[in-house]
Interface confidence: low
């Protein structure tokens, strides 16, 4: 199936040019998306090209500027947030990145009624997190690991917590491991729907071992960065959840929400909090051995001023074949009765599907079914449920949006997106206004991305929000590679692959092959999305064939494939890449003497193991910021898939699955190892240990470090990295510079 044919005709060949590395590094062919910032059923905010904040009313067709670019510029604001009563806007400036999601910033409050900044009781700086209440204009913020509350922006703050301490106690914000591996947010506080209560998490990292690394900077002596970071088997953070009445915050103070007994009996995690009503909250907990999750619905007892979580409102989700959930345990979407909910979990056939839970999980009603997976529930209204899945035409790497009518019986299903722009758009997400009156569809490909606005009742397209016309015009004279998405059937396993082929691809010729791998549990690389990136350039200009393969352990094709890697990381992911390469060779157009593999992070681990597999298939390969031993990586992630590194659990496979154990096998390949020295996520330690093992084995290899760079290797390092990797591959494939 050719998804993106190149537009090359003989008459045009002279005017067409190949992609250059410079195109990629300059972001020449990047695309735009349009996500409305919904503020009601029919209104949204959007930052215009000239940086005005504009309010759009879909029904009247009117728009007006609520905040001028002049006001934004006066405090160098890079972000904004309108209070729900529309009286105030916070302006965010001095953005300073911390980890993946977290950052600190300076906040100014602008009063829209008088056109002035609020003076008096200004916010401290820098703030770690700030948000409006869902109704009115209360403010909650986190400063120096403590939570503060303001009833109005000009009021003095009320301090909710007092025990916050850097690297020790975190209130309202996650510590490193919860941010990266559990919550995937910069915040750990949640307003109730009408702003009566504020729930928050407290993380105690007092007993967690610390990772320390040098940050070289410009000073005479390097700084040492210390992060409480639990590696596999280490002591974990202790979490507690509290709720405070924001109307009378001082009276009772924060009330702790009890942990379900079956969870509290051993090490556990808090995984998410969902408000149902102002006086009902749903908490999800997870055992440290992550195959048991408990969803607990708690009610406010006004007479006691406490939160009551009856056992009858505990719902257990357990996996007998792997871990609970996909990458994370799914979160519930509550229906209008405020007790029943919709949730995605595995059905009896081992496919993730939407279920409706009214009383017990055992009595759950299955809403979707089939040999495909429901991926996300976007919105539940009185009469409709909107979700995404990869059902259409049995392509796991697609995403379409569906509507199920839940107001009628039997429920009827309609694919909203399947036939809208079928060639251009096969991978969608959506953003809904209040009550799903309207929604935006964002199509990511395989064609050029496009964002559109739709009527939530009829699904009619109202207007195009962003169609990337400039990008379309810029690509008219570019020889883009061809892309195919197909599958291999091997020993009852389906291996989907994406192949990126040079523009003048000729099946009778031989081409060098580069495998790009990620391969981590519950990931997906073979997706029907648009991209003009480094591998596009390698195909377009350098004439390489690039392939991406989703093997065992990858997502959205059922539990059999997903949980195949449970407790055995580093085995089947590698085997399946190798199997795919052998199949590609059989296709006849691959030069067997010029095959390489590269990957980043988990992909660096898989590429390293593939190079050291002893198959003789790979001439060379690159590992960027690889994991080298699961004992070096974060507890929450690692133990989910590997269990504990203890003798009575899974220590043996922890030891057997290291890159270092295969040092000897790198002797017959060209290996390029790359890592940032300030990687807070996959620590430089991983590559340091690979390098040490290779030196000890007297195996030659190439390496590059990036001083003071983290896991993303951003900025100028990106340019250097891709230039360096390009030279390495061209040398490996004997391609002239």
């Amino acid at each position: 199936i050719v998804l993106r044919p190149s537009r090359v005709h003989n008459s045009e060949e002279n005017t067409m040019r190949a992609l250059t590395l410079k195109d990629i590094l300059n972001g020449t062919f990047s695309y735009k998306t349009f996500f409305p910032n919904w503020i009601s059923g029919q209104e949204y905010l959007h930052q215009s090209a000239d940086n005005n904040i504009v309010l759009y009313n879909i029904e009247t067709g009117q728009s007006y500027t609520i905040l001028s670019n002049r006001t934004m510029k006066s405090v160098n604001a890079s972000n904004y947030g309108l209070s729900p009563d529309r009286q105030f806007v916070y302006l965010e400036s001095d953005y300073s990145k911390l980890w993946r999601y977290s950052y600190t910033a300076t906040y100014y409050i602008y009063d829209l009624s008088n056109g002035e900044f609020v003076r008096g009781n200004e916010l401290p700086r820098p703030i770690q997190y700030l948000c409006w209440s869902p109704v009115g204009s209360k403010l909650a913020y986190v400063y120096q690991n403590n939570i503060y509350l303001k009833q109005r922006p000009g009021d003095p703050p009320f301090q909710i917590t007092f025990n916050g301490r850097e690297n020790k106690i975190f209130n309202g914000i996650p510590d490193w491991v919860y941010e990266e591996e559990m919550l995937a947010t910069k915040y750990a506080l949640w307003w109730s729907p009408n702003g009566k209560f504020l729930a928050y998490a407290e993380f105690n990292d007092t007993d967690i071992p610390v990772i320390a690394y040098s940050y070289y900077g410009d000073e005479q002596y390097p700084r040492t960065i210390n992060i409480p970071y639990p590696k596999a088997g280490a002591k974990n953070p202790v979490v507690r959840i509290f709720i405070i009445d924001t109307t009378y915050p001082a009276y009772v103070g924060p009330q702790e929400v009890p942990v379900p007994a079956m969870i509290a009996s051993s090490d556990y995690y808090f995984s998410w909090l969902t408000w149902v009503t102002d006086e009902r909250v749903c908490l999800q907990w997870l055992k440290r051995v992550q195959n048991v999750s408990v969803l607990s619905i708690c009610d406010f007892r006004e007479d006691w001023q406490t939160w009551d979580c009856p056992k009858t409102q505990e719902h257990i989700e357990e996996s007998r074949t792997g871990w609970a959930g996909g990458f994370f345990v799914s979160t519930p979407v509550f229906s209008y009765d405020a007790i029943s909910y919709y949730k995605i979990f595995s059905d009896k056939d081992g496919y993730k599907h939407i279920h409706y839970i009214k009383d017990t999980v055992e009595n759950a009603i299955q809403i979707t079914s089939g040999k495909w997976e429901a991926i996300n529930i976007f919105r539940v209204t009185q009469d409709s449920l909107f979700y995404s899945s990869n059902e259409f035409e049995e392509y796991p790497g697609r995403r379409n949006i569906y509507r199920i009518s839940i107001g009628s019986y039997p429920p009827s299903k309609k694919c909203v997106t399947c036939h809208l722009r079928k060639e251009r758009c096969q991978y969608y997400t959506a953003s809904f206004s209040d009550y799903a009156k309207y929604y935006a569809l964002v199509c990511y490909g395989p064609g050029i991305p496009i964002s559109t606005l739709h009527d939530g009742r009829t699904d009619q397209e109202i207007k195009i929000l962003e169609e990337n016309k400039e990008l379309e015009n810029a690509l008219k004279n570019i020889q883009l590679p061809k892309e195919e998405i197909k599958k291999l059937e091997v020993d009852e396993i389906t291996l989907w692959y994406k192949m990126i082929l040079p523009p003048q691809f000729d099946r009778s010729k031989k081409y060098p092959l580069l495998i790009q791998v990620y391969g981590g549990p519950c990931s997906q690389s073979v997706r029907s999305v648009f991209a003009v990136n480094w591998i596009s350039y390698l195909a377009s200009k350098e004439g390489m064939v690039i392939a991406l393969v989703d093997g065992r352990g990858t997502a959205f094709q059922g539990d059999k494939l997903l949980y195949a890697v449970y407790r055995k990381l580093g085995v089947y992911e590698v085997e399946d890449q190798i199997t795919a390469v052998r199949k590609f060779i059989e296709m006849g157009f691959i030069d067997e003497k010029r095959i390489a593999i590269w990957g980043w992070s988990y992909g660096g681990y898989v590429s390293s193991l593939a190079l050291a597999s002893g198959t003789g298939l790979f001439k060379c390969g690159i590992a960027v910021a690889p994991v080298s031993s699961w004992e070096y990586y974060a507890s929450v992630y690692t133990e989910r898939f590997m269990g504990l590194p203890t003798k009575d659990d899974n220590l043996e496979h922890y030891k057997n699955s290291t890159v270092m154990a295969r040092a000897e096998y790198f002797r017959n390949v060209d290996y390029l190892l790359i890592h940032g020295t300030a990687d807070d996520n996959v620590h430089f330690q991983n590559s340091a240990q690979i390098a040490k093992a290779l030196v000890n084995a007297q195996v030659d290899f190439q390496a590059m470090w990036y001083s003071d760079q983290n896991h993303g290797l951003s900025g100028l390092s990106t340019n250097h990295l891709y230039t360096h990797m390009t030279h390495f591959l061209k040398q490996c494939f004997s391609l002239s510079d």
Epitope: D245, T247, Y248, Y251, V252, G253, Q255, R301, E302, D303, W304, Q305, T306
Partner: nanobody, 115 residues
Framework: QVQLQESGGGLVRVGGSLRLSCAVS????????MGWYRQAPGKRREWVAT???????NYADSVKARFTISRDNAKNTVYLQMDSLKPEDTAVYYC?????????WGQGTQVTVSS
């Protein structure tokens, strides 16, 4: 219906001490958080201190480190130990749940601090 009866007030010199009691009767559940409140002449009633069923305590900034709230669940009684009294502590003191969800307030007990 819950009945509240405050006692223990009186006239005291600056720096002196008093111990207030609040007897709770009727359909009272000891899991309620209880609080002390006060109202000075010509002013609005303000919150003073809270004690939860688990005996966690909270105090208004103006009384921190001088007043101590306690409770005896067996006797359904809440106490307020007032030390280092100041003239600005002069008020009628009341008890109620915290927040004050009981509709019927007691008569209160007068505390007067003279210099």
């Amino acid at each position: 219906q819950v009945q509240l009866q405050e006692s223990g007030g009186g006239l005291v010199r600056v720096g002196g001490s008093l111990r207030l009691s609040c007897a709770v009767s009727g359909s009272f559940d000891s899991r309620n958080s209880m609080g002390w409140y006060r109202q000075a002449p010509g002013k609005r009633r303000e919150w003073v201190a809270t004690i939860t069923s688990g005996s966690r305590t909270n105090y208004a900034d103006s009384v921190k480190a001088r007043f101590t709230i306690s409770r005896d669940n067996a006797k359904n009684t809440v106490y307020l130990q007032m030390d280092s009294l100041k003239p600005e502590d002069t008020a009628v003191y009341y008890c109620n749940a915290a927040p004050p969800i009981f509709n019927s307030w007691g008569q209160g007990t007068q505390v007067t601090v003279s210099s």
